[in-house]
C-alpha cells in the first residue's frame, strides 16, 4: 500500500482566526467540506498526511520527485516522494536531495566545479531509466542557481522555466530541457488526459500563455477521442 | 521589502465578471505558489484558489470551481482570477498570498493560510443581486 513508502509527516493545523478549511488539488471528487481533491480520502495516512499527486518533478517539493509509490508500479499514479539521500540509489537527477545528483545510479555530493561537466554525461545515462520522466535534469534550486546567470533564450538548456526569459517556458525536447515560447491563442496544446502523461513526451509543449487555457477546437468535438485537437483559447 | 498589491475588486450585479490582480515586488516570486483567500463580514478567512510555483497545477475551492480562474505570469510577478458568474455569496475582502515551495508537500499544503508568508492588504468584492 502506499502507506508503507510514505513519511510520517504531519500537517500544521490551521491557528485561528485564518481557519480556512484544508485543501487538495482541484478535481472532480470532495474529500473535504468546500475543497476538492482527486481520488477522495484514497491516500489517507494515520496521521493526517495526503501525499500529493503529481505529473512531473516540479510539482513536488524541493525534497521530493515525482515518481510510482511502487516498484513497477502503474505509472498513471504518481505521488511525490521523499528524495534520496547521499549513496542511494537513483535514475535521474530529481531523485537526490538538493546539494546531490545522479551518477552511475547513485546519489553524490554536486562538487560544483564539476557538475557542469557531470551533468552532460549523465543526460545520456538517464535517458529511458524512469517511467515518469525523460529528463537527465534536476530542478534542484541549489544547483540551477549557480548554473545560470542570465535567463535563457530560446533553445537554450534549463533545469525550469524560472530559467528562461519571458514568453519562455522550460520544456523536454529528446532528453535535455531547453527554453521553448509559451504557446499563443489557437496554437496547438497538449491536454494530459492521465497523471504521468508529461513523462511520456519526447517534444514537450510549453503551456498555454496567460488568459489562455489548453481547450478541445471547436470543429473538433466530432471526432474521435483519440484525434482530438487542443488549441490554447481564451477563457 | 517584499509586497503583495491586489487590484481589480469593485462592485458587480449577480452573473457578472471581475478580474483580480496581484502584483509582487522586492523579490522574485517564482518559486511561491499565489493564491487568493477571501473573508466575508463575520467570516473566517476562507481559501480560493491557488496556482502553483511550476504553473501546471491549480487548486480551487468547491464553492469556485468553474466559475474562478486563477492564473500567473511570473516574468510579470503578477497572478490574475477571472471570477465569473459571480453571486452575492461571493462578497467578500479578496487577499493575495504567497506560500514558499515547501521541502515536503501534502494535498492540503495550499489551502493552509498557515503556510502563506507574504500577504495583501485585500481588495473589496461586491456582488449585488
Known amino acids: 500500500t502506499l502507506n508503507s513508502v510514505l513519511n510520517s509527516n504531519a500537517i500544521k493545523n490551521l491557528p485561528p482566526p485564518l481557519g480556512g478549511a484544508a485543501g487538495h488539488p482541484g478535481s472532480a471528487v470532495s474529500a473535504a467540506p468546500g475543497i476538492l481533491y482527486p481520488g477522495g480520502n484514497k491516500y489517507q495516512t494515520i496521521d493526517n498526511y495526503q501525499p500529493y499527486p503529481c505529473a512531473e518533478d516540479e510539482e513536488c517539493g524541493t525534497d521530493e520527485y515525482c515518481a510510482s509509490p511502487t516498484r513497477g508500479g502503474d505509472a498513471g499514479v504518481q505521488i511525490c516522494l521523499a528524495c534520496r539521500k547521499r549513496r542511494k540509489r537513483c535514475m535521474r537527477h530529481a531523485m537526490c536531495c538538493p546539494g546531490n545528483y545522479c551518477k552511475n545510479g547513485i546519489c553524490v555530493s554536486s562538487d560544483q566545479n564539476h557538475f557542469r561537466g557531470e551533468i552532460e554525461e549523465t543526460i545520456t545515462e538517464s535517458f529511458g531509466n524512469d517511467h515518469s520522466t525523460l529528463d537527465g535534469y534536476s530542478r534542484r534550486t541549489t544547483l540551477s542557481s549557480k548554473m545560470y546567470h542570465t535567463k535563457g533564450q530560446e533553445g537554450s538548456v534549463c533545469l525550469r522555466s524560472s530559467d528562461c526569459a519571458s514568453g519562455l517556458c522550460c520544456a523536454r525536447h529528446f532528453w535535455s530541457k531547453i527554453c521553448k515560447p509559451v504557446l499563443k491563442e489557437g496554437q496547438v496544446c497538449t491536454k494530459h488526459r492521465r497523471k504521468g502523461s508529461h513523462g511520456l513526451e519526447i517534444f514537450q509543449r510549453c503551456y498555454c500563455g496567460e488568459g489562455l487555457s489548453c481547450r478541445i477546437q471547436k470543429d473538433h468535438h466530432q471526432a474521435s477521442n483519440s484525434s482530438r485537437l487542443h488549441t490554447c483559447q481564451r477563457h | 521589502e517584499v509586497q503583495l498589491v491586489e487590484s481589480g475588486g469593485g462592485s458587480v450585479q449577480a452573473g457578472g465578471s471581475l478580474r483580480l490582480s496581484c502584483t509582487a515586488s522586492?523579490?522574485?516570486?517564482?518559486?511561491?505558489?499565489m493564491a487568493w483567500f477571501r473573508q466575508a463580514p463575520g467570516k473566517e478567512r476562507e481559501f480560493v484558489a491557488a496556482?502553483?510555483?511550476?504553473?501546471?497545477?491549480?487548486h480551487y475551492a468547491e464553492s469556485v470551481e468553474g466559475r474562478f480562474t486563477i492564473s500567473r505570469d511570473n516574468a510579470k510577478n503578477t497572478a490574475f482570477m477571472q471570477m465569473s458568474s459571480l453571486k452575492p455569496e461571493d462578497t467578500a475582502v479578496y487577499y493575495c498570498a504567497a506560500a514558499p515551495r515547501p521541502k515536503r508537500i501534502s494535498v492540503r499544503y495550499f489551502s493552509t493560510s498557515s503556510n502563506y508568508d507574504y500577504w495583501g492588504q485585500g481588495t473589496q468584492v461586491t456582488v449585488s443581486s
Open positions: 496556482i502553483s510555483w511550476s504553473l501546471t497545477r491549480t
Open positions: 522586492g523579490r522574485p516570486f517564482d518559486n511561491y505558489a
